[in-house]
C-alpha cells in the first residue's frame, strides 16, 4: 500500500489551532514539478457534507513529502470530509478523514467501520442532545433510512446493513429531522472487496494474517498497518511517537501522538495512534490494553509486561507476541519484511536462525508462494546464528507474493513470512523526442512513457547512423534532463533509442522503439550581392545577383529573395530553388511601392548572410482617369461620348475602355475597347430605344488606369429593339438587357 498518512489534530478548544497534515513516505512524493512524482493534495471535500462557506483554508507545503491545512475560524469549518491524495500513477491513493462536531445532537460510537464483503455492518449513533423527532440516515448525501425517535436503544440509534458489498462503502450520517446537518453523526464505511482473510481477483488468495489490528488490502494482499506498527504482517512495534510504514515519521509536539487521529489508505480508515483512545484520542490505554484505539489486549505470559505502545515486553529467555515462545525454540532472525527483485533474475536470499539445538543447513528451508520448497546451497555458521543462502531459480511474475523461511529443530519450529515483489524492468512505449537540431548535434528529450515498473534509476540513449552496421554509441543520462548528442555528421539520419533501468540487478529493460533524427546541413557562408535590377512593368521586377568565387562545391540549395514594403509593414519572400540561378523575375508586386530588396543563399533550412540591401521604386499602376466625360443621345439607338485626355501621363496611351450598363439593371456591365487612343469621342451604337444608360471609361498604358466619373443618358424613343450596343461599327459580344 502507499505510505500515506493523514493526521488530524483534535485539540478542539480553539478551532484556529486545529490542523490537518498529510505525510507521504513515498520516494519523490509531493515534488509537483518532478515528472516522476505528482504533488500531494489536501482539501476539504464538500460534495457530501456541505458546510457554510468561510474564509479559504491555508495550505502549506513542508518539504517534498508533507502538506498542512490550517485557517479554520469556527467549529463548523471542521465538520465534514477531508481528503489527501498522494502516490504516482496506478498507486495514486486517497486517504479520507471524517470530522464530527463534539457538540452535535448525535455522535458516532465509532467513526470508521471496516468490514468484509458479505458482513453485516452496524453503525451506532449515540444521543448527545435529545430531540423528539425522527432520525434520518443518509448514505453519501442521499436519503437512506428513517427511524422513529422511540427506536433508540440504550440511547443509541442503530443502522444495520446486512450482507454489505463494496458499493455500500461511503459516508453515512444520522441526523434528527429539523436539525442542522452540522449536528449529524458522520461515519465512514469501508467494505473490503473480499470476504474475511481473502484478497485478489476472485478473492482466491489468502491474506498473510495481519497482526496488531492491521487490515489486509483486498487488491494486493499487503497489510495496512495501524499507526505505530510495521513489518509485512505488522508484527513489529515502532518506538513510541513514531509512525509510517517504516516508523520513519515522528508525531509533532511534546506529548507525542496524543490528540491526533491517524487516517491511512483504505481499507484501514482512521484510528488514534498506538497507546491512545477516545473520541479525541486524548485518553491513554487502560492497563492490559495497547495499540491503536487501545483495541488490543496484551495477555502476556511468562512474566511479560504490557506496554501500551508495543504490547508484551518479554523477559530474558522468552519471545513471541504473548512471550509464549522459549528462546530454546528456534527463531528466525532479522528477516526483511519485504524484498524486491527484477523479473528473470536469479537472486540469492539469506535466512538466519538461532536456537538450541543450533540450526544446521538442512533445517532451514525457503517456501515460494506456489508451495515449492527450496533447500539452501550453503550455510554460514557463526557462534550466535546460522545463515542459510538460497539460490533462487529465474524469477517469474507469479513469484510475487508471500515467501516463507522456516526453521525446524528438535526444540520446535519458527517461520517468518516476507513479501517478494517481482518487478518488471521498464520498457519505453514511445521513441525519444527531438527538440532541436544543428549540423553536428541533436538535442533529445529522453523522458517517455513506459510499461513495467519504476522508479527509473538510469536512462541510456543508444544512437548510430541510419542503415549502419557499426556499433551503437551509448550515453547515460539523468532521467529528468534533455540530452545533447554531440560530434555528429551533418545532413545524416540517426537511429535513436531509449533504454530504461530500474534499481537492482537485472533492472535494465529492453530497448524502446527507434526513431529517425536527421542532423541539419552546414550553414551556407557565402554572401551574395545584387548586380542590378530593372522594372519590367508596374508590378514586375527583374533582379540579378552574383556570388564570390571560392574553391570547391557550392554549399547551398537555392536563394531567398526578400522584398520589404516599409509603408505597409509587409515582407514578401521569393524562393529560387536552383543554386546556379543568378536572376529572377518578381511579379505581382504593388505598383507605386518603395521596396527594400536583398538576397541570401540557403542550405536545407539554414540561411546564409544577406546581401547588402537595395532600394527599388516601382512606377504607379496606370494612367489617371479621362477628364470631362459627356454623353449625348443621337437617336433611339445611338449615344455619343466625348472626353478629354488624362493629364500628366507617364507614357503613351495604348487604348481606352468604355463601360456600358443599363441604369438599374442587374446584368453585368459591358466593356468596349476604343483602340484609337488619339480620339476624344466615340459613338456607341445598337442601344435600345427609350432606355437609360450609365457610362464610364478609363485609359490603359502598361496597365489599366483609374475610372472616370459616371455619366447617364437615355436613348430617344419610338425605336425598335436593338441587337445590342456596338462602338462605331464593331459588334458587342452580348446585349445589355439579355
Amino acid at each position: 500500500a502507499v505510505d500515506l498518512t493523514l493526521l488530524a489534530n483534535l485539540r478542539l478548544t480553539d478551532p484556529q489551532r486545529f490542523f490537518l497534515t498529510c505525510v507521504s513516505g513515498e520516494a519523490g512524493a509531493g515534488r509537483g514539478s518532478d515528472a516522476w512524482g505528482p504533488p500531494l493534495l489536501l482539501e476539504k471535500d464538500d460534495r457530501i457534507v456541505r458546510t457554510p462557506p468561510g474564509p479559504p483554508l491555508r495550505l502549506a507545503r513542508n518539504g517534498s513529502h508533507q502538506v498542512t491545512l490550517r485557517g479554520f475560524s469556527k467549529p463548523s469549518d471542521l465538520v465534514g470530509v477531508f481528503s489527501c491524495v498522494g502516490g504516482a500513477g496506478a498507486r495514486r491513493t486517497r486517504v479520507i478523514y471524517v470530522h464530527n462536531s463534539p457538540g452535535a445532537h448525535l455522535l458516532p460510537d465509532k467513526v470508521t467501520h471496516t468490514v468484509n464483503k458479505g458482513d453485516t455492518a452496524v453503525l451506532s449513533a449515540r444521543v448527545h442532545k435529545e430531540k423528539q423527532t425522527d432520525v434520518i440516515w443518509k448514505s453519501n448525501g442521499s436519503y437512506f433510512y428513517t427511524l422513529d425517535w422511540h427506536e433508540a436503544q440504550d440511547g443509541r440509534f442503530l443502522l444495520q446493513l446486512p450482507n454489505v458489498q463494496p458499493p455500500s462503502s461511503g459516508i453515512y450520517s444520522a441526523t434528527y429531522l429539523e436539525a442542522s446537518p452540522l449536528g449529524s453523526a458522520f461515519f465512514r464505511l469501508i467494505v473490503r472487496g473480499c470476504g474475511a482473510g481473502r484478497w485478489g481477483p476472485g478473492c482466491t488468495k489468502e491474506c498473510p494474517g495481519c497482526l496488531h489490528g492491521g487490515v489486509c488490502h483486498d487488491h494486493d494482499g499487503e497489510c495496512v498497518c495501524p499507526p505505530g506498527f510495521t513489518g509485512t504482517r505488522c508484527e513489529q512495534a515502532c518506538r513510541e511517537g513514531r509512525f509510517g510504514q517504516s516508523c520513519q515519521e515522528q508525531c509533532p509536539g511534546i506529548s507525542g501522538c496524543r490528540g491526533l487521529t491517524f487516517c491511512l489508505p483504505d481499507p484501514y480508515g482512521c484510528s488514534c495512534g498506538s497507546g491512545w483512545r477516545g473520541s479525541q484520542c486524548q485518553e491513554a490505554c487502560a492497563p492490559g490494553h495497547f495499540g491503536a484505539d487501545c483495541r488490543l489486549q496484551c495477555q502476556c505470559q511468562n512474566g511479560g509486561t504490557c506496554d501500551r505502545f508495543s504490547g508484551c515486553v518479554c523477559p530474558s529467555g522468552w519471545h513471541g507476541v504473548h512471550c509464549e515462545k522459549s528462546d530454546r525454540i528456534p527463531q528466525i532472525l532479522n528477516m526483511a519484511s519485504e524484498l524486491e527483485f527484477n523479473l528473470e533474475t536469479m537472486p540469492r536470499i539469506n535466512c538466519a536462525a538461532a536456537g538450541n539445538p543450533f540450526p544446521v543447513r538442512g533445517s532451514i528451508e525457503l517456501r515460494k508462494p506456489d508451495g515449492t520448497v527450496l533447500l539452501s546451497t550453503k550455510a554460514i555458521v557463526e557462534p550466535e546464528k546460522t545463515t542459510a543462502e538460497f539460490e533462487v531459480p529465474r524469477l517469474v511474475l507469479a513469484d510475487s507474493g508471500f515467501w516463507e523461511c522456516r526453521v525446524s529443530t528438535s526444540g520446535g519450529q519458527d517461520s517468518r513470512r516476507f513479501k517478494v515483489n517481482v518487478k518488471v524492468p521498464p520498457v519505453p512505449l514511445a521513441a525519444p523526442r527531438l527538440l532541436t537540431k544543428q549540423s553536428r548535434q541533436l538535442v533529445v528529450s529522453p523522458l517517455v512513457s513506459f510499461s513495467g515498473d519504476g522508479p527509473i534509476s538510469t536512462v541510456r540513449l543508444h544512437y548510430r547512423p541510419q542503415d549502419s552496421t557499426m556499433d551503437w554509441s551509448t550515453i547515460v543520462v539523468d532521467p529528468s534532463e534533455n540530452v545533447t548528442l554531440m560530434n555528429l555528421r551533418p545532413k545524416t539520419g540517426y537511429s535513436v533509442r531509449v533504454q530504461l533501468s530500474r534499481p537492482g540487478e537485472g533492472g535494465e529493460g529492453a530497448w524502446g522503439p527507434p526513431t529517425l533524427m536527421t542532423t541539419d546541413c552546414p550553414e551556407p557562408l557565402l554572401q551574395p550581392w545584387l548586380e542590378g535590377w530593372h522594372v519590367e512593368g508596374t508590378d514586375r521586377l527583374r533582379v540579378s545577383w552574383s556570388l564570390p568565387l571560392v574553391p570547391g562545391p557550392l554549399v547551398g540549395d537555392g536563394f531567398l529573395l526578400r522584398l520589404w514594403d516599409g509603408t505597409r509593414g509587409q515582407e514578401r519572400r521569393e524562393n529560387v530553388s536552383s543554386p546556379q540561378a543568378r536572376t529572377a523575375l518578381l511579379t505581382g508586386l504593388t505598383p507605386g511601392t518603395h521596396y527594400q530588396l536583398d538576397v541570401q543563399l540557403y542550405h536545407c533550412t539554414l540561411l546564409g548572410p544577406a546581401s547588402p540591401p537595395a532600394h527599388v521604386l516601382l512606377p504607379p499602376s496606370g494612367p489617371p482617369a479621362p477628364r470631362h466625360l459627356h454623353a449625348q443621345a443621337l437617336s433611339d439607338s445611338e449615344i455619343q461620348l466625348t472626353w478629354k485626355h488624362p493629364e500628366a501621363l507617364p507614357g503613351p496611351i495604348s487604348k481606352y475602355v468604355v463601360e456600358v450598363q443599363v441604369a438599374g439593371g442587374a446584368g453585368d456591365p459591358l466593356w468596349i475597347d476604343v483602340d484609337r487612343p488619339e480620339e476624344t469621342s466615340t459613338i456607341i451604337r445598337g442601344l435600345n430605344a427609350s432606355t437609360r444608360y450609365l457610362f464610364r471609361m478609363r485609359a490603359s498604358i502598361q496597365g489599366l488606369g483609374d475610372w472616370s466619373n459616371t455619366v447617364e443618358e437615355s436613348t430617344l424613343g419610338n425605336g425598335l429593339q436593338a441587337e445590342g450596343p456596338v462602338q462605331e461599327s464593331r459588334a458587342a459580344e452580348e446585349g445589355l438587357d439579355q
Epitope: K138, L147, D148, E151, E178
Partner: antibody
C-alpha cells in the same frame, strides 16, 4: 418507475372487516416511512396511519385507533391496513403514500381503492 | 381530531396570482417546518406541490411557492392557468400524527 398500487377495497357491512394492500415497486420499499390517507366522498383528505421502515413503530388517527392496524412486509414490498369494526363513516377512497425521504411530504401516492361500509 | 383551516374557495383570472392560507396552532403549523401542499384534480390522487414549507419537488412549476408566518402557512400560485383549477390541501405534523387542511377549491375564471 416508482409506483404504489392499492387493492382490497369493496363493499362491507357495518361491523365487518377488510384488509387493504399496497404493492410498492421502483424503489427500496424497506427504507421508507409509509402512510394511509383516506377521502370520504365529496370531502377532504384525512390522515389515517403511518408506519416506520422497521415496522416497529406505528401511529394512528384518533378516529381509527383500536380498530385499524397498519403493517408491512418488506420482503414482499407490501403495505397493509387491517380494518375491523367498520362503520359507515369509514366509507372513503383509501390511498397509500410514501414519505419523501428526509421530509414529511408524501411524494408518491397510489391511485386509491374504494371502501364502502353499508348495510 | 381537528383539521387545519383553509378558505373553502379562491378564484382568479388567467395570469393573475392567488394565495391560499392554512391556519393552525403553535403545536402544528407554528412549531413544524414540515408543512406540505398537495394538488388534487377531480377523480385523481393528490400530488405533492410543496414540501418543508417552501421547497418544490423536481417537475413542479416555479409558479407555485410556499411560505410560513407564525401559525399560518401560505401557497401562492402566480400566472394562473386553466390547468390550475383543482382542490388544494395543506398538511402539517404534530408529535405523533399528520394533519390535513380542510381543502380549498381553486376556480380559474
Amino acid at each position: 418507475e416508482v409506483q404504489l398500487l392499492e387493492s382490497g377495497g369493496g363493499l362491507v357491512q357495518p361491523g365487518g372487516s377488510l384488509r387493504l394492500s399496497c404493492a410498492a415497486s421502483g424503489f427500496t420499499f424497506s427504507r421508507y416511512v409509509m402512510h394511509w390517507v383516506r377521502q370520504a366522498p365529496g370531502k377532504g383528505l384525512e390522515w389515517v396511519s403511518r408506519i416506520y421502515p422497521s415496522g416497529g413503530w406505528t401511529y394512528y388517527a384518533d378516529s381509527v385507533k383500536g380498530r385499524f392496524t397498519i403493517s408491512r412486509d418488506n420482503s414482499k414490498n407490501t403495505l397493509y391496513l387491517q380494518m375491523n369494526s367498520l362503520r359507515a363513516e369509514d366509507t372513503a377512497v383509501y390511498y397509500c403514500a410514501r414519505v419523501a425521504g428526509e421530509s414529511n411530504g408524501m411524494d408518491v401516492w397510489g391511485q386509491g381503492t374504494t371502501v364502502t361500509v353499508s348495510s | 381530531q381537528y383539521e387545519l383551516t383553509q378558505p373553502a374557495s379562491v378564484s382568479g383570472s388567467p395570469g393573475q396570482s392567488i394565495t391560499i392560507s392554512c391556519t393552525g396552532t403553535s403545536s402544528d403549523v407554528g412549531g413544524c417546518n414540515y408543512v406540505s401542499w398537495y394538488q388534487q384534480h377531480p377523480g385523481k390522487a393528490p400530488q405533492l406541490l410543496i414540501y418543508d414549507v417552501s421547497y418544490r419537488p423536481s417537475g413542479v412549476s416555479n409558479r407555485f411557492s410556499g411560505s410560513k408566518s407564525g401559525n399560518t402557512a401560505s401557497l401562492t400560485i402566480s400566472g394562473l392557468q386553466a390547468d390550475d383549477e383543482a382542490d388544494y390541501y395543506c398538511s402539517s405534523c404534530t408529535s405523533s400524527s399528520t394533519l390535513f387542511g380542510t381543502g380549498t377549491k381553486v376556480t380559474v375564471l
